[in-house]
Interface confidence: low
């Protein structure tokens, strides 16, 4: 292809310096904090007779860098040190031997703001492309996680809630997911970009907040989304279902065993008593179920322990309306095991329990 035919392909900035060495790259790129960007880049250089068989090394430097003194932010030269603050985050993704200088930035940080220039070295042929330079702008993280609730939430029925950050990139440090909820929960599996929370709502969880917080540790930035739980009640005869969760709240991690109490308990023996009585008896025990982090999982995927140890069901024969009780689900300690209690009512309006003790579930 005649060289003259290539001229229309060149950007004006590329020709401004030296027509022997030219580079095509967008002059500005914007990336949100914690996220990533791939900047396409092509460069050309003549290959002298004495360097035809030499390997090509590419380097990205910060503007103002002195080649002989300063380390690059990224390079394909294996034995070359790179800047500590960009190590593992800036990558020369392109293959310089194919004239590709594409730069990948992951876990973008505020201090990545600035201009960068590319340099090639092939044997004794060395050149720094001072124009055009790449200007990187790191802005606030405005993306927020998405919480998906399949179907409706019914008291006593477990549902898998998914918190996803589909806008995050595969190459970055996997984010840390944290869930905050008053409702009985445990962790389900996770992927790089999503976390599943198994929730078993109680009537009093209606209208309470559930938060999914996502921390991009690579950049030290956090984003979250909070929703209000909408727990619906299926009209039916009042029944009580006792369905234990993982009573111990134990979860194996690489770091060891993390103990946690998620909250909500019922005792079969007390079911025959008035619900109001239960409410007042156990109110004082409530504070013993502490706000606890249930798990910090470093493995992928993460599976929370949600399998029941035993199942009991019994019918409650009693008043269908107990206004003084307002659907309270007390928490008690028994034999160091916690159980979830669920009461199904029809036509009841549960009030929020102002002393609800939240539990936090983290997954990484």
């Amino acid at each position: 292809m005649p060289l003259l035919l290539l001229l229309p392909l060149l950007w004006a900035g590329a020709l401004a310096m030296d027509p022997n060495f030219w580079l095509q790259v967008q002059e500005s790129v914007t990336v949100q904090e914690g996220l990533c960007v791939l900047v396409p880049c092509t460069f050309f250089h003549p290959i002298p007779y004495y360097d035809k068989n030499s390997p090509v090394h590419g380097y990205w430097f910060r503007e103002g860098a002195i080649i002989s003194r300063d380390s690059p932010v990224a390079t394909n030269k294996l034995d070359q040190e790179v800047q500590e603050e960009t190590q593992g985050r800036f990558r020369l993704l392109g293959d310089p031997s194919r004239n590709n200088c594409s730069l990948s930035i992951v876990d973008a940080r505020r201090r990545d703001n600035g201009s960068y220039f590319f340099r090639m070295e092939r044997g004794s042929t060395k050149y720094s492309y001072k124009s055009p330079q790449l200007s990187v702008h790191v802005t606030d993280l405005t993306h927020r996680p998405k919480i998906l609730i399949p179907g409706t939430l019914e008291p006593g029925h477990s549902k898998n809630l998914t918190c996803s950050v589909s806008w995050a990139c595969e190459q970055g440090t996997p984010p840390i997911f944290s869930w905050l909820s008053a409702a009985p929960t445990s962790l389900g599996p996770r992927t790089t970009h999503s976390s599943v929370l198994i929730i078993t709502p109680r009537p009093q969880d209606h209208g309470t907040n559930l938060t999914c917080q996502v921390k991009f540790a690579g950049a030290g930035v956090t984003t979250e989304r909070t929703i209000q739980l909408n727990v619906t009640y299926v009209p039916q005869n009042p029944t009580t279902g006792i369905f234990p969760g993982d009573g111990s709240g134990k979860q194996e991690t690489r770091a060891g065993v993390v103990h946690g109490a998620i909250g909500g308990a019922g005792v079969t023996a007390l079911l025959a008593l008035c619900l109001c009585l239960i409410f007042f008896i156990v109110k004082t025990h409530r504070r013993k179920a502490a706000r606890t982090a249930v798990g910090r999982n470093d493995t992928h995927p993460t599976t929370g322990s949600a399998s029941p140890k035993h199942q009991k069901k019994s019918k409650l024969h009693g008043p269908t309306e107990t206004s003084s009780c307002s659907g309270a689900a007390p928490t008690v300690e028994m034999d160091e095991e916690l159980h979830y209690a669920s009461l199904n009512f029809h036509g009841m309006n549960p009030s929020k329990d102002t002393s609800t003790e939240y539990s936090e579930v983290r997954t990484q």
Partner: antibody, heavy 117, light 111 residues
Framework: QVQLVQSGAEVKKPGASVKVSCKAS????????YHWVRQAPGQGLEWIGF????????GYAQKFQGRVTMTVDTSTSTVYMELSSLRSEDTAVYYC??????????WGQGTLVTVSS | DIVLTQSPDSLAVSLGERATINCRAS??????????MHWYQQKPGQPPKLLIK???FLESGVPDRFSGSGSGTDFTLTISSLQAEDVAVYYC?????????FGQGTKLEIK
Amino acid sequence: QVQLVQSGAEVKKPGASVKVSCKASGYTFTDYNYHWVRQAPGQGLEWIGFIYPSNGITGYAQKFQGRVTMTVDTSTSTVYMELSSLRSEDTAVYYCARSDVDYFDYWGQGTLVTVSS
Amino acid sequence: DIVLTQSPDSLAVSLGERATINCRASQDVSTSTYSYMHWYQQKPGQPPKLLIKYASFLESGVPDRFSGSGSGTDFTLTISSLQAEDVAVYYCQHSWEIPLTFGQGTKLEIK
């Protein structure tokens, strides 16, 4: 400003050797290659070889292989070209030329070497 | 070795007229990006002076009446409007491989 200043004219007898110098100034000496090109009276340009001071790479035309040696003294920013076993047909103006990549952007003024018995 | 053949050997052109010098390489000296061919001007008693690099790029400081074109094996140096100071010998040179070689030269005179 960029300058390549060569040593003065030489008259040599056949079979002798000649060493021509080329002193560079006005830029970073080791960033460039240095070539030697000769021109016989009334004739065209003939490439002899090159040297790259920063890593000692050299390359010579086959015709001069074994007779030519190019060296460099980075402390004085000087390149040298020594041609041995001189013959009458080696009579020529010898130029040193600077090369950024592979064209010659600056040339010395030339050194006339006359080989005569 | 790559042989460069210039044509014509000598050329006489009137002032203000166009002068065209050709250079043919015995093998391809171009890639998709670059043509490794350069042009020099040499006036009597002076060293050569670089005019055009990589077939078509004008060296800085060279008047824009000089231009270069071509790829592969055939290259052209053009002087769009001949001036008196353009009287010289013109050489093409390749840098595709060792040895580097020059064309035999084209002598340009004023008609």
